[in-house]
């Protein structure tokens, strides 16, 4: 529980509590915004982002966005609130401990996005089919 001497301010999203008043720790995520990347045609890639940030709000999760167009490849690493869309997409896999990339439809580019909720989980982005969430073993891990 939040102790009596720690005030709980009303309508403040810096404090996230469960029904018993337990306080949620914030996520630690790679946070380099958009950087050029050499990650291409691989089962998985490291972000090569040297910045690990404390997410500002405890409800935020780690996100990675991989984009490829005719000119370049970029990788975006951020914290984001899964209740809000990112790049117009819902973060449907936010509870996953791993960042499993899923392709999204974006005109003029190849666009993959993943989200996850373990420390620095957006440092290792996974494209491989064997990690697809249709895998029941992965679902077991996610929802345990």
């Amino acid at each position: 529980t939040i102790p009596p001497h720690v005030q709980k301010s009303v309508n403040n999203d810096m404090i996230v509590t469960d029904n018993n008043g337990a306080v949620k720790f914030p996520q630690l995520c790679k946070f380099c915004d958009v950087r050029f990347s050499t990650c291409d045609n691989q089962k998985s890639c490291m972000s090569n982002c040297s910045i690990t940030s404390i997410c500002e709000k405890p409800q935020e999760v780690c996100v990675a966005v991989w984009r490829k167009n005719d000119e370049n490849i970029t990788l975006e690493t951020v914290c984001h609130d899964p209740k809000l869309p990112y790049h117009d997409f819902i973060l449907e896999d936010a509870a996953s401990p791993k960042c499993i990339m899923k392709e999204k439809k974006k005109p003029g580019e190849t666009f993959f996005m993943c989200s996850c909720s373990s420390d620095e989980c957006n440092d290792n982005i996974i494209f491989s089919e064997e990690y697809n969430t249709s895998n029941p073993d992965l679902l077991l891990v996610i929802f345990q």
Partner: nanobody, 124 residues
Framework: EVQLLESGGGLVQPGGSLRLSCAAS???????RMWWVRQAPGKGLEWVS?????????YYADSVKGRFTISRDNSKNTLYLQMNSLRAEDTAVYYC?????????????????WGQGTLVTVSS
């Protein structure tokens, strides 16, 4: 019994420095990630900085990067926060908290995670 005892707060002028300490007892200090958390008057909790149990890897909120330095002395079971270039917006009660790596929520027991805090006031 788990105890976290913060000290070192006080009144300081803008641009000044303070060093906070958190003396920990009643648990295996080297197993826990430690945090400094602050609460400004009428505001919510802000997670200021964290340090891993071994290897001393550190993390900072954007609001304090380059000004605050977290450290720990595992032989003394003590956590520190060196605060430089203090600003009025750093005025808050500062708490230390412990987190088992991988753990998402603080336990229900109030004494398991919070000290009484130490007040830092930055004012001219």
């Amino acid at each position: 019994e788990v105890q976290l005892l913060e000290s070192g707060g006080g009144l300081v002028q803008p641009g000044g420095s303070l060093r906070l300490s958190c003396a920990a007892s009643g648990f295996t200090f080297t197993e826990y990630r430690m945090w400094w958390v602050r609460q400004a008057p009428g505001k919510g909790l802000e997670w200021v900085s964290a340090i891993e149990p071994i290897g001393n890897r550190t993390y900072y909120a954007d609001s304090v990067k380059g000004r605050f330095t977290i450290s720990r002395d595992n032989s003394k079971n003590t956590l520190y926060l060196q605060m430089n270039s203090l600003r009025a917006e750093d005025t808050a009660v500062y708490y230390c908290a412990k987190q088992m790596p991988g753990q998402k929520w603080m336990a229900k027991s109030r004494f398991d995670y919070w000290g009484q805090g130490t007040l830092v006031t930055v004012s001219s």
